[in-house]
Interface confidence: low
């Protein structure tokens, strides 16, 4: 179904004359008769096929021919097809003389035709206009044509029957080719299928209407990406629903058991960050100007001996300043004025002339380090201390500050970690060289047997159509995760399915 | 976007022929008919005549009559204006112009060349 | 061929005035005139067609008026840019499409 347009633009008639000759009196007043018909290698008269359109008179002699589409006008003349367009045509157009205001052919004489013309070819449907100028002796015509599909027709002949809609059995518009093309939000075959938000979980997920994310039993969140816990899970997180893995610091089937060291005990001092590293075990982070297991030490600017060759370091309330040996300037004393001449290798260091003797290098004897051999060697760098004890000089000795766990003058000796009992329901500790291992009891599993295991209620794979089953610790039942496309508790009911054609 | 290129300038001598051309792209090029109207320097615009791109068909103004030949190559959309017999007062700048008729602009002149130089001179 | 007389021939105005230009048929063109600028150098730009349509781009301060053979193009409140020649045309009787001889609207 479509519209063969027609839009007149120029008629042309000089003389004012009609087709016999005769001129008209006192002009000729013109309209034209249209006839569209199928394609003829010669048009002949005969049924106009195709359709017929006449038009009111539309001017005297030569005149243009105004297009009146916008106000509801008759130009382009319209003729309506209900059938598929066959890309071939013919055309007559002929140029009548009114002489009354009765424009039926039976009220005009005979010799009223001012001109005829006839056309046929090829046509496809399209917005582009095809313009032609017809002359004739006495007359030039200048018109425009083309072929239009209807209202719901696409397609290369206007054969292509598609209807928006946005209801229930489809959300698109028509793309020029009569395919669908989704509304935004909606998508598949039919454009039935919403578009679910962003992100949402493929199996976890699904949604009624576009940018909706709907969770399915055991799953949480704006995108149903996070499964749902143990029901009473305290200090715990699951991987997939009903889980309750403890966070760290925290024991029990609930995860309800402090086990955070840091909490119970706030070993670390002087304003210190406090970091569990596992039962028992903690590390701190000191603050600027503290250091110790426990950042318990003030340490000073100073103690990083920021000052060469020498040098003498004095702390001051923002950082320190270095007071440099004759011979050294700069703000770490690390630039020299003097040669081996002035003697500058301290604690029996031999020197070395560099340079041309520009400048030299001490070698300093065991026990003795830095530029100028003016530092002992730190009892403290070869870092005797085991098990990530602490070495602090004190004196003219050294001593280790041992981890909880550990003691002995290098901290080599491992304290029996199963003393504090750590396994949960009659689990039975073993000490092992890296800390300790719970043999647990029928029943219980997990790092300290805090775990209690339940009958596995999935183990009659009890779901259908490929669900994902999950077991319910709290109550010893399952839960069934359907596909897309099932419901019910064990996934065993379809969805109903559209029908094949909504249209 | 619709664009009318047009050739370079060109310095004739009285008595000799010019073709300027005017190639279009970015629409159907046989769909529009293309007029050329021309400048002459300090003065105002001059219709010289029109082409109908689909079957070659022109019409010029009187004035130009024997003078002027409209030409178009569909295969290059590229549409011709040869003047002949140049004169002095031939010296202007020429102007080809799509023609609008479809629902809007009818017959008037949206699109236009960047214009080209003649300049006619012993 | 119908003549169409441009007026005034030149119009000296400051920025932010009213502009008025007037075009005269020497026969009825209906409502068949288009008004177009011209700037120098460059090729004369649509911005009224059919006596009073605006062309696409063009501003709201230009508008044009009239049928007949009496015809107005207005700038509502002149804008640097829109110093220029200025040029009616009719297409009602044809050949040839005639031009007015322009009206140059200068900076005062």
């Known amino acids: 179904s479509g519209v063969f347009q027609l839009q007149l633009q120029e008629f042309i008639n000089e003389r004012g004359v009609l087709a016999s000759g005769r001129p008209c009196e006192p002009g000729c007043r013109t309209f034209f008769r249209v006839c569209l018909k199928h394609f003829q290698a010669v048009v002949s008269p005969g049924p106009c096929t195709f359709g017929t359109v006449s038009t009111p008179v539309l001017g005297t002699n030569s005149f243009a021919v105004r297009d009146d589409s916008s106000g509801g006008g008759r130009n382009p003349l319209q003729l309506p097809f209900n059938f598929t367009w066959p890309g071939t045509f013919s055309l007559i157009i002929e140029a009548w003389h009114a002489p009354g205001d009765d424009l039926r052919p039976e009220a005009l004489p005979p010799d009223a035709l001012i001109s005829k013309i006839a056309i046929q070819g090829s046509l496809a449907v399209g917005q582009n206009w095809l313009l032609d100028e017809q002359t004739s002796t006495l007359t030039r015509l200048r018109y425009s044509y083309r072929v239009i599909c209807s209202d719901n027709y696409y397609g290369d002949n206007c054969s292509r029957l598609c209807k928006k809609r946005n209801d229930h059995f489809g959300h698109y518009v028509c793309q020029p080719d009569g395919n669908l093309s989704c509304l935004p939000g909606w998508t598949g075959e039919y454009c039935q299928q919403p578009i679910c938000l962003s992100g949402c979980h493929e199996q976890n997920g699904y949604c009624s209407k576009p940018a909706e994310c709907l969770c399915r039993p055991g799953w949480q969140g704006r995108l149903c990406n996070e499964c749902i816990p143990h029901n009473g899970c305290r200090h715990g997180t699951c991987s997939t629903p009903w889980q309750c893995t403890c966070d760290e610091g925290w024991g029990g089937l609930f995860c309800d058991q402090d086990l955070n060291y840091c909490t119970h005990h706030s070993p670390c001092k002087n304003g210190a960050t406090c970091s569990n590293s596992g039962q028992r075990s903690y590390t701190c982070t000191c603050r600027p100007g503290y250091t110790g297991v426990d950042c318990e030490l003030e340490l000073s600017e100073c103690d990083s001996n920021p000052c060469r060759n020498g040098g003498s370091c004095k702390d001051q309330e923002d950082g320190y300043h270095c007071l440099c040996p004759p011979g050294y300037y700069g703000l770490h004393c690390e630039h020299s004025t003097l040669s081996c001449a002035d003697s500058p290798c301290f604690n029996g260091g031999s020197c070395r002339e560099r340079n041309q003797g520009a400048n030299y290098a001490c070698e300093c004897p065991p026990n003795f380090t830095g530029s100028n051999c003016e530092k002992k060697v730190d009892r403290c760098t070869s870092n005797p201390c085991a098990n990530g004890g602490q070495c602090l000089n004190r004196g003219p000795s050294r001593m280790c500050r041992c981890r909880p766990g550990f003691t002995g003058t290098y901290c080599e000796l491992h304290v029996s970690d199963c003393a504090r009992n750590p396994c949960a329901h009659g689990g039975t500790c073993h000490d092992l060289e890296n800390g300790l291992m719970c043999t647990c009891p029928a029943g219980f599993s997990g790092r300290r047997c805090e775990v209690r295991t339940s009958i596995d209620a999935c183990a009659s794979s009890p779901c259908f159509n490929r669900a994902t089953c999950y077991t319910d610790l709290s109550t010893d039942t399952f839960v069934c995760n359907c596909p897309y496309g099932f419901v019910g508790s064990r996934c065993e009911f379809p969805v109903g399915l559209p029908p094949s054609f909504p249209w | 976007q619709v664009q009318l290129v047009q050739s370079g300038a060109e310095v004739k001598k009285p008595g000799a022929s010019v073709k300027v051309s005017c190639k279009a792209s970015?629409?159907?090029?046989?769909?529009?008919?293309m007029h050329w109207v021309r400048q002459a320097p300090g003065q105002g615009l001059e219709w010289m005549g029109i082409i109908n791109p689909s079957g070659g068909s022109t019409s010029y103004a009187q004035k130009f009559q024997g003078r002027v030949t409209m030409t178009r190559d569909t295969s290059t959309s590229t549409v011709y204006m040869e003047l002949s017999s140049l004169r002095s007062e031939d010296t202007a700048v020429y102007y080809c112009?799509?023609?609008?008729?479809?629902?809007?602009?009818?017959?008037?002149?949206?699109?236009w060349g960047q214009g080209t130089l003649v300049t006619v001179s012993s | 061929e119908i003549v169409l007389t441009q007026s005034p021939a030149t119009l000296s105005l400051s920025p932010g005035e009213r502009a008025t230009l007037s075009c005269r048929a020497s026969?009825?063109?209906?409502?068949?005139l288009a008004w177009y600028q011209q700037k120098p150098g460059q090729a004369p730009r649509l911005l009224i067609y059919?006596?009073?349509n605006r062309a696409t781009g063009i501003p709201a301060r230009f508008s044009g008026s009239g049928s007949g053979t009496d015809f107005t193009l207005t700038i509502s409140s002149l804008e640097p840019e829109d110093f220029a020649v200025y040029y009616c045309?009719?297409?009602?009787?044809?050949?040839?499409?005639?031009f007015g001889q322009g009206t140059k609207v200068e900076i005062k």
């Open positions: 112009a799509r023609e609008e008729y479809s629902g809007s602009s009818a017959e008037y002149f949206q699109h």
């Open positions: 970015g629409y159907t090029f046989t769909s529009y008919y």
């Open positions: 026969q009825s063109v209906s409502s068949y």
């Open positions: 059919d006596a009073s």
């Open positions: 045309q009719q297409r009602s009787n044809w050949p040839p499409w005639t």
